[in-house]
């Protein structure tokens, strides 16, 4: 269940060094106690890795993707799953580990020499690619720095939000993805239920802008579940 995933008793590491006036806060040397965390949390070791609940790939780490842990994909909570290595099966780019992308259902190396043309093919051929991500260092880092000299303007084809100019995000439009405006206060937004329903949207909306979150509009609380209207509202 969601609670059991969240409330796992993972072994925690100590926090990093604090370095007072004489210390070096910029360094990452031996650990020392001293940071107050909500609920007394410390750090989780990778050895005691616990799956994290998610609604979309961007909520997971760079070496993970968001999906249902069961094969059918319809059983309750989605969690962050370890990315797939080269030559493993995939359905979208985010499933592949950094330095790879999903082509014809297989994770392949993102060879920079052949990248540009293949990406453009892949955008149009992959309707299921919800959160396409592709660059060579980490699939989450900016593609534009390696391939595109300018950030995509509204309507430009993109793979992920970092390909788009400030104030835009990369969202699906028909069978490709384009840069669309980030939503402003009062604009209608999509609140994804945790079963990955966002994978079915042909016209995907951007997320709400800075300082806003997608919540049920006050006067729609009484409406039935299916007709509830969500808008971007101040925190």
């Amino acid at each position: 269940t969601l609670n059991s995933v969240l409330n796992s008793n993972a072994i925690k590491n100590l926090p990093p060094p604090l370095g007072g006036a004489a210390g070096h806060p910029g360094s990452a040397v031996s650990a020392a106690p001293g940071i107050l965390y909500p609920g007394g949390n410390k750090y989780q070791t990778i050895d005691n890795y616990q799956p994290y609940p998610c609604a979309e790939d961007e909520e997971c780490g760079t070496d993970e993707y968001c999906a249902s842990p069961t094969r059918g994909g319809d059983a309750g909570v989605q969690i962050c799953l370890a990315c797939r290595k080269r030559r493993k099966r995939c359905m979208r780019h985010a499933m592949c580990c950094p330095g790879n992308y999903c082509k014809n259902g297989i994770c392949v190396s993102s060879d920079q020499n052949h990248f540009r043309g293949e990406i453009e093919e892949t955008i149009t051929e992959s309707f299921g690619n919800d959160h396409s991500t592709l660059d060579g260092y980490s699939r989450r880092t900016t593609l534009s720095s390696k391939m595109y000299h300018t950030k995509g303007q509204e309507g430009s084809v993109c793979l992920r939000s970092s390909d788009c100019a400030s104030g835009l995000c990369c969202a699906r439009h028909f069978w490709s993805k384009i840069c669309k405006p980030v939503l402003k206060e009062g604009q209608v937004c999509t609140k994804h239920r945790r079963k990955g329903s966002h994978g079915l949207e042909i016209f995907q909306r951007c997320y709400c802008g800075e300082g806003l979150s997608c919540r049920i509009q006050k006067d729609h609380h009484q409406a039935s579940n299916s007709s509830r209207l969500h808008t971007c509202q101040r925190h």
Epitope: P16, Y52, E58, E59, C60, C80, Y137, Y207
Partner: nanobody, 125 residues
Framework: EVQLVESGGGLVQAGGSLRLSCTAS????????VGWFRQAPGKEREFVTG????????YYADSVKGRFTISRDNAKDTAYLEMNSLKPEDTAVYYC??????????????????WGQGTQVTVSS
């Protein structure tokens, strides 16, 4: 290794606002988690807020919820902390920190490997 530099601190009256910036260099900022911590004189450093690599997840300590907003611009290798309705008890040195975001976890639970030198925020009553 990622180097972090904070800016935007200063003296402000209670009820006022400040915007802190944390600019990174020397690493893949857009694949890191970013946290803001603060340390008041004679107190332990505390976790204030955090944001994951994509900006899709944020976390706020109860003491700043509704007043502080964290955001990031990966294209500029910069994270921001917008602080509104400041109180005297917000007075502290504010540190920006980051760490690898390979595996998701609660934002306070990350291993923050790289730290800035801090920027002083003073709220007068």
């Amino acid at each position: 290794e990622v180097q972090l530099v904070e800016s935007g601190g200063g003296l402000v009256q209670a009820g006022g606002s400040l915007r802190l910036s944390c600019t990174a260099s020397g690493g893949a900022f857009s694949s890191t988690v970013v946290g803001w911590f603060r340390q008041a004189p004679g107190k332990e450093r505390e976790f204030v807020t955090g944001i994951n690599w994509s900006g899709a997840r944020t976390y706020y300590a109860d003491s700043v919820k509704g007043r502080f907003t964290i955001s990031r611009d990966n294209a500029k290798d910069t994270a921001y902390l917008e602080m509104n309705s400041l109180k005297p008890e917000d007075t502290a040195v504010y540190y920006c920190a980051s760490g690898r975001d390979r595996y998701a976890r609660a934002l306070p639970d990350y291993e923050y490997l790289w730290w800035g030198q801090g920027t002083q925020v003073t709220v007068s009553s």
